[in-house]
Amino acid sequence: LIIGFGISGRHSITVTTVASAGNIGEDGILSCTFEPDIKLSDIVIQWLKEGVIGLVHEFKEGKDELSEQDEMFRGRTAVFADQVIVGNASLRLKNVQLTDAGTYKCYIITSKGKGNANLEYKTGAFSMPEVNVDYNASSETLRCEAPRWFPQPTVVWASQVDQGANFSEVSNTSFELNSENVTMKVVSVLYNVTINNTYSCMIENDIAKATGDIKVTESEIKRRSHLQLLNSKAS
């Protein structure tokens, strides 16, 4: 969480950003809020990126003002227009690219003053893993698959029964480059699994951490998975 204050103006206004991560090929959000104004005509939102000459996005007098927008962001940005009046300056970024990573500044002018705050935006690929029983294998085997990751993650297996056990000797992980030549498919196989146990496949890089759980009993198989972005926490 980064809070910035304006330097000049009738008085400085508080602008707050939250570091976030974008999943390449998907839409992302750069989060920014500010002390609201009561009239739209006086609100100016400018998004800038370090190292980029043109603007990322500008919104003023109730409209997008894109004449100064940098080419790399053309047609890819939008504010939540209906939320500007209540102090939401967040930017929607379409079709996130690896090159969108960097330091962004959310700069706000209202009738009450000015303010700005920076945010770090990381880009990569992350996806939910799915763990299944591999019935084709000769022994009891689990297969953990996640379709899109970048940069290359680490994969660690864990078990509820054998807590703290190291499964690296009985597992095998491979990374297969996807067709767009950036992201990779992650496949990890765990051998010699026992019944009535819960196994977790944990995939992690510097952007996200995802876990796929599977519980295999005589009568049923239960699955659960979740994904957590690592750099969206307050800082």
Epitope: H11, E35, P36, I38, K39, L40, S41, D42, E61, G62, K63, A81, D82, Q83, I85, V86, G87, K112
Partner: antibody, heavy 117, light 107 residues
Framework: QVQLVQSGAEVKKPGASVKVSCKAS????????MHWVRQAPGQGLEWIAA????????DYNQKFKGKAKITAVTSTSTVYMELSSLRSEDTAVYYC??????????WGQGTMVTVSS | EIVMTQSPATLSLSPGERATLTCKAS??????VAWYQQKPGQAPKLLIS???YRYTGVPDRFSGSGSGTDFTLTISSLEPEDFAVYYC?????????FGGGTKVEIK
């Protein structure tokens, strides 16, 4: 849930003053503007003023400068509007309303102020 | 001051009919217009914000459109509970101003 609870009806003589209150709950009081809007009997809506409790910034309709004064007490999440030099044409229902997610998305129940000799 | 002019002042329609209410701003207000419904003895209720965003819990028979100076509130098929007074309001500039209202009454 968001609630705005206003003080009760008032009957005042011409020239007197009245202070109407609006107690907010269910949201972060200091983060959103609170407005006052009035409606004379059988008439439309008229914006009076607004206050941002986070720093006590105010914005007034020029028409009501000198007539209305708004204040906020953050410890009790209450906004007050004082109307001075009352005249019969100030007889109206006075509403407090806030802008949390959208413009004027929550309203108080209204306070009837009657000015009569 | 931005003047908001609503028309018609009164609209006499039957349940099931379509209602079209208009609001004209005296200058460009972008999309900064909200619509409210008010019934006798009650506070106004937000229906549409930012010209076209239907507020939470508002039935989808209500829709808003327009930008610049011309705005429309449409009720696709009137229900008995829709007979009320409707106000438009601009938040583009201060003083914030409301239209004079359109009363939708049963024919």
């Amino acid at each position: 849930q968001v609630q705005l609870v206003q003080s009760g009806a008032e009957v005042k003589k011409p020239g007197a003053s009245v202070k109407v209150s609006c107690k907010a709950s269910g949201y972060t009081f200091t983060s959103y503007w609170m407005h006052w809007v009035r409606q004379a009997p059988g008439q439309g809506l008229e914006w009076i003023a607004a206050i941002y409790p986070g720093n006590s910034d105010t914005d007034y309709n020029q028409k009501f400068k000198g007539k209305a004064k708004i204040t906020a007490v953050t410890s009790t999440s209450t906004v007050y509007m004082e109307l001075s030099s009352l005249r019969s044409e100030d007889t109206a229902v006075y509403y407090c309303t806030t802008t949390v997610a959208h413009y004027f998305d929550y309203w108080g129940q209204g306070t009837m102020v009657t000015v009569s000799s | 001051e931005i003047v908001m002019t609503q028309s018609p002042a009164t609209l006499s329609l039957s349940p099931g009919e379509r209602a079209t209410l208009t609001c004209k701003a005296s200058q460009d207000v972008s999309f900064a217009v909200a619509w409210y419904q008010q019934k006798p003895g009650q506070a106004p209720k937000l229906l549409i914000s930012s010209a076209s965003y239907r507020y939470t819990g508002v039935p989808d028979r209500f829709s808003g459109s327009g930008s610049g100076t011309d705005f429309t509130l449409t009720i696709s098929s009137l229900e008995p509970e829709d007979f009320a007074v409707y106000y438009c309001q601009q938040h583009y500039n201060t003083p914030l101003t409301f239209g004079g209202g359109t009363k939708v009454e049963i024919k």
